[in-house]
């Protein structure tokens, strides 16, 4: 079994709906700095045929562009294949569909391999509740506290949300 964290009870459909990005982490800081390729923010998610579809917001030229991405299911329940800035093995690390989701990606771009983690929540007012869980997952996979960026409202394209 790949990772001991299973997909949410009731299936991926429970992940559907609105989400808010709270924190990012990476061993390669350039990826999550402002204008970094993984400084992107979740808007919403849906699931179909075992695949995860996400609308993400990407800051560009002072605006935020909404882009749709699909993470395709694999033989492993918590692992997905995502083509974005290279190839990504995307893992659902910790999931509470009503509250928060922690994912991490092993990104391969040209000859470079990097680790990126992402914390998202349903309710922004509760974001502090889930940061310790994110820090714990990050530590476990080898990302340190100083490699975590906690996002502000200005960061996460709040103005671009419907």
């Amino acid at each position: 079994q790949e990772g001991n964290h299973e997909e949410p009870q009731g299936g991926l459909e429970e992940l559907s709906g609105r989400w808010h990005s709270v924190a990012l982490a990476s061993n390669k800081s350039d990826l999550i700095k402002p204008w970094g390729h993984f400084r992107v923010f979740i808007h919403s998610m849906s699931a179909k045929d075992g695949n995860l579809h996400g609308d993400i917001l990407i800051p560009q030229d002072g605006q935020c562009e909404k882009v749709s991405l699909t993470a395709f299911k694999t033989a492993t329940s918590n692992k997905f294949d995502l083509e974005y800035w290279g190839h990504n093995d995307l893992y659902l690390a910790e999931v509470d569909p009503k509250s928060y989701l922690i994912l991490y990606m092993i990104n391969q771009y040209n000859d470079d391999t990097s680790l990126v983690a992402h914390l998202m929540v349903r309710d922004l007012s509760r974001q502090q509740d889930f940061l310790p869980a994110f820090e714990s997952v990050c530590e476990d996979i080898g990302l340190h506290k100083d490699q975590i960026v906690v996002l502000s409202d200005d960061d996460r394209c709040q103005g671009s949300r419907d």
């Epitope: 990772g3 690390a93 991490y104 530590e139 080898g142 990302l143």
Partner: nanobody, 122 residues
């Protein structure tokens, strides 16, 4: 002093199973992601699988996905690689290595064992 010692290799028929062990000691939590790599004759060393510090998170190369399982017992400072449905192309020297981050690249691993030979042949 950092040490990683592999064991459990041997000769096995195609379709058979082996369990490799990697006993580690002497390093801090910072280098406690453990990976398995392998090197077949005349080929470069390649990533096989890795496991996070707690054992909660794992990563495999595609060719072994579903056949190999990596696990760890932190109380015994040991990481295991259960290899099922072995194929002749799995023949290689298998190395365990310790690194700081769950990535499938050799250069991320600072400490290496001496290796154990796995031969899959009828």
């Amino acid at each position: 002093q950092v040490q990683l010692v592999e064991s459990g290799g041997g000769l096995v028929q195609p379709g058979g199973s082996l369990r490799l062990s990697c006993a580690y000691s002497g390093f801090t939590l910072d280098n406690n992601v453990i990976g398995w790599f392998r090197q077949a004759p005349g080929k470069e060393r390649e990533f096989v699988a890795a496991i996070s510090r707690s054992g909660a998170f794992t990563h495999y190369t595609e060719s072994v996905q579903g056949r190999f399982t990596i696990s760890r017992d932190n109380a015994k400072n040991t990481v295991y690689l259960q290899m099922n449905s072995l194929k002749p192309e799995d023949t290689a020297v298998y190395y365990c290595a310790a690194g700081a981050i769950l990535l499938p690249t050799e250069r991320r691993y600072d400490y290496w064992g001496q290796g154990t030979q796995v031969t899959v042949s009828s």
